[in-house]
Interface confidence: low
């Protein structure tokens, strides 16, 4: 006889319409029911739902909902998972590989993790490592074939070799980019002394006493001399390679400087033409500067003629720029000929062609143009409403009409409205409200009032401000907001303390540093008293520094 199946209790899932179906159990073999699995669980076919079948041996599948693990939960630094699946089911294993130069904790190039009941079995790890390097004229002082990040490997030179001036041992460190350097030792007889001097030139770096083989040193020529040959020399077999030569350049005629002059030009004129390499001081006229931005500099005779070719450049001043609703972020105050300067418009402003920034150029007669930033408004975000016209950008004072969706209104009975593009953007948002969510006038408060004229109806999110009468302390937020047809909790106005002459006379005291007959103090204020002339304190010293607490003050007493 075929055994029926009881109602299936599905772990991490359930039958669809289970409350309706529960009545029809137990069920006969051959019956099938649709079921679903909870989040992070799937059916054996990998779907979030499937059919469960009543068989002679009971329900099939026996485990309807299997745990899943997501590839996105795997954080793998310096490694990767090459498999394309993004979801893995219970007991499924996935392989990960480490990037070249990285290995698993066990020293392998790849590893695996398994999807378990509580998620991935572990987080994969790829640790930086370095292989044993290639030694040159040297040997390692320790064993081991691979090294972790920051590991140090000491090495020693073969006899007659050294790693640097006088040293025969050194260390290399395993870093993110591999070994810090190669474990190389050099034949000490192959070291070089300082590089040779050259006429009209010099080395670019601070020369040292000793250089290792294959060291390179760069030369440069003095101004107005041209470098001939390689600018580098290399140390090889104890000798430097051939250094370059510095060749003089051709002569220059007297320089006619537009908008400027040589200093002492009349004295100097007879000595022209001059050889390359010569330099003369010159100055520029008003509103002109040298290429370095100074009013004077040196003009140099080079093989290609005078340098700079244009010794005096027109300048434009930042102070000549009037820019409303925009700004220039560059720090310079003076700009030379053909120099372009960028300007940006403030948020909500744009150039005449609608961009957020523009540029002007320093020309022979001053700035190419005055920058301009015009106010604009973008198409706003509509809430329960739509625009009655097209267009994406609106100029200052432009109007945009809008209408509410059915069942919504702007204010008491109105379903259309307009907004205006102003200096601060749109006059308001084009918002329509569900009539049931509006509020009546905000509630009154004792010893205080609202700061604005109150309306009969307020749309949701309207805010109203309160203020307290003089000397009363406002407690809570000074604003209330309309939400779901109700106002938020209004503030309280806490009583001040009124210090009267009558009360002070009763206690033979007076205000310290004040001659007021009546004095008002807010909650939390400290009021300083002193005894009247001829009276002595009858209460503690502390009592003469009384604190106002919600309209009540404890007076000190003098006798």
């Amino acid at each position: 006889e075929v055994k029926p199946c009881d109602f299936p209790e599905i772990q991490h899932g359930g039958l669809y319409y289970k409350s309706l179906r529960r009545l029809y159990f137990p069920a006969a073999a051959g019956q099938s029911y649709s079921y679903y699995c909870d989040q992070n669980f799937v059916t054996p076919s990998g779907s979030y739902w499937d059919y469960i079948h009543c068989t002679q041996d009971g329900w099939s599948p026996t485990v309807p909902c299997l745990r899943t693990c997501s590839k996105s939960d795997v954080e793998i630094e310096n490694g990767f998972i090459s498999e394309s699946s993004s979801i893995y089911i219970l007991n499924e294993e996935t392989q990960y590989n480490c990037k070249p130069g990285y290995a698993t904790a066990e020293g392998n190039s790849s590893g695996s993790i398994t999807c378990l009941q509580n998620g991935w079995s572990t987080q994969p790890i790829c640790i930086k490592f370095c292989d044993m390097p290639v030694f040159e004229n040297s040997r390692a002082k320790s064993n081991g074939m691979w090294f972790k990040l920051h590991d140090t490997l000491d090495y020693e030179c073969y006899d007659g070799y050294e790693s640097s001036y006088g040293n025969t041992t050194d260390s290399i460190v395993c870093g993110e980019d591999g070994w810090s350097h190669l474990p190389t030792c050099y034949n000490s007889s192959e070291n070089c002394g300082p590089p040779p001097p050259i006429s009209n030139g010099d080395t670019t770096s601070f020369p040292q006493k000793v250089y290792l083989p294959w060291s390179r040193v760069e030369y440069q020529c003095q101004s107005y001399y041209e470098l001939q040959g390689s600018k580098y020399v290399t140390c090889s077999n104890g000798d430097w390679s051939e250094p370059p030569r510095c060749i003089s350049m051709k002569p220059c005629e007297f320089p006619e400087i537009q908008h400027g002059h040589l200093y002492y030009e009349n004295t100097r004129r007879p000595y022209f033409p001059v050889a390359t390499g010569q330099s003369y001081s010159y100055y520029c006229d008003q509103n002109f500067v040298t290429p370095s931005g100074s009013y004077w500099d040196y003009i140099h005779c080079t093989q290609d003629g005078w340098l700079p070719t244009v010794p005096c450049l027109r300048t434009c001043s930042k102070s000549d720029i009037e820019i409303e609703n925009g700004f220039i972020s560059e720090s310079s105050s003076i700009y030379i000929l053909n120099k372009e300067i960028q300007y940006k418009c403030k948020p909500g402003y744009a150039t005449a062609d609608g961009n957020s920034s523009g540029s002007i150029t320093c020309l022979q007669n001053g700035w190419s143009a005055q920058p301009i930033c015009i106010k604009f408004c973008d198409m706003p975000v509509f809430e329960n409403s739509r625009a009655k016209s097209n267009g994406m950008r609106f100029k200052l004072h432009d109007t945009l009409d809008y209408e509410c969706y059915d069942g919504y209104e702007i204010s008491y009975g109105n379903t259309t409205g307009s907004i205006v593009c102003g200096e601060d953007g749109w006059s308001h948002f084009p918002t329509c409200y569900n009539s049931s969510e509006k509020c009546g006038p905000p509630p009154p408060i004792s010893n205080g009032d609202t700061t604005s004229f109150l309306l009969k109806v307020y749309v949701p999110q309207s805010r109203v401000e309160y203020q307290c009468q003089s000397y009363y302390e406002l407690q809570g937020s000074n604003y209330v907001t309309c939400s779901n047809g109700e106002w938020s909790e209004p503030p309280r106005c806490i009583h001040p303390c009124i210090i009267t002459e009558e009360n002070m006379n009763k206690n033979n005291i007076q205000l310290k540093g004040k001659s007021d007959i009546k004095y008002y103090a807010k909650t939390g204020d400290t009021i300083e008293f002193m005894c009247k002339l001829g009276y002595n304190a009858n209460t503690s010293v502390l009592s003469f520094q009384a604190v106002c607490r919600e309209g009540i003050v404890e007076y000190p007493r003098c006798e």
């Epitope: 002394g193 300082p194 020369p207």
Partner: antibody, heavy 121, light 106 residues
Framework: QVQLQESGPGLVKPSGTLSLTCAVS?????????WSWVRQSPGKGLEWIGE???????NKKPSLKSRVIISVDKSKNQFSLKLISVNAADTAIYYC??????????????WGQGTMVTVSS | EIVMTQSPATLSVSPGERATLSCRAS??????LAWYQQKPGQAPRLLIY???TRATGIPVRFSGSGSGTQFTLTISSLQSEDFAVYYC????????FGQGTRLEIK
Amino acid sequence: QVQLQESGPGLVKPSGTLSLTCAVSGGSISSSNWWSWVRQSPGKGLEWIGEIYHTGSTNKKPSLKSRVIISVDKSKNQFSLKLISVNAADTAIYYCARDREGGTTEAFDIWGQGTMVTVSS
Amino acid sequence: EIVMTQSPATLSVSPGERATLSCRASQSVSSNLAWYQQKPGQAPRLLIYGASTRATGIPVRFSGSGSGTQFTLTISSLQSEDFAVYYCQQYDNWRTFGQGTRLEIK
């Protein structure tokens, strides 16, 4: 024990050239050392001018480079300083010095006693 | 150019007391720093090189420390002959001296 001795005129005219020589005794100028010139204006601190190696290699203070010439004469075991286009600001005590034996760059362990040079017309 | 700044400009200390002089480099000079002592009418004298190594014949009361950009010269117990001007000098990239610290008797 190496000793250094500066020599040269004590008075130089403005726009003229200051010329000094440093004689090395008790050792060879061809040793592995830099031979330096350092000056000290009256009441001021020390200013390194430049240095030379026996092969003729030189280091010069970048701001003085265009006015400084340092040379070596191995046959006389001496080195020299020429400072061109001098002015009153070049008035100072001029010292020659040697850097320590050893590493690629070292401190000055031997100094001459200094010579006063005045720039005046 | 690497700028060397010494502080203080003048230091007044009593004989037998400790003196601490500071020197700061505008960029790292590693340990390529020396300290010199200069007395009136004399050439400078090397005290410390390599930031912390005493030169030949320098008494143990002189010690140097620091590396990179911050250096200190300490004289543990001042003798009358120690009152002079002290200069630091870097020799890592070209050579520049500090402006000097005058150590005077309090």
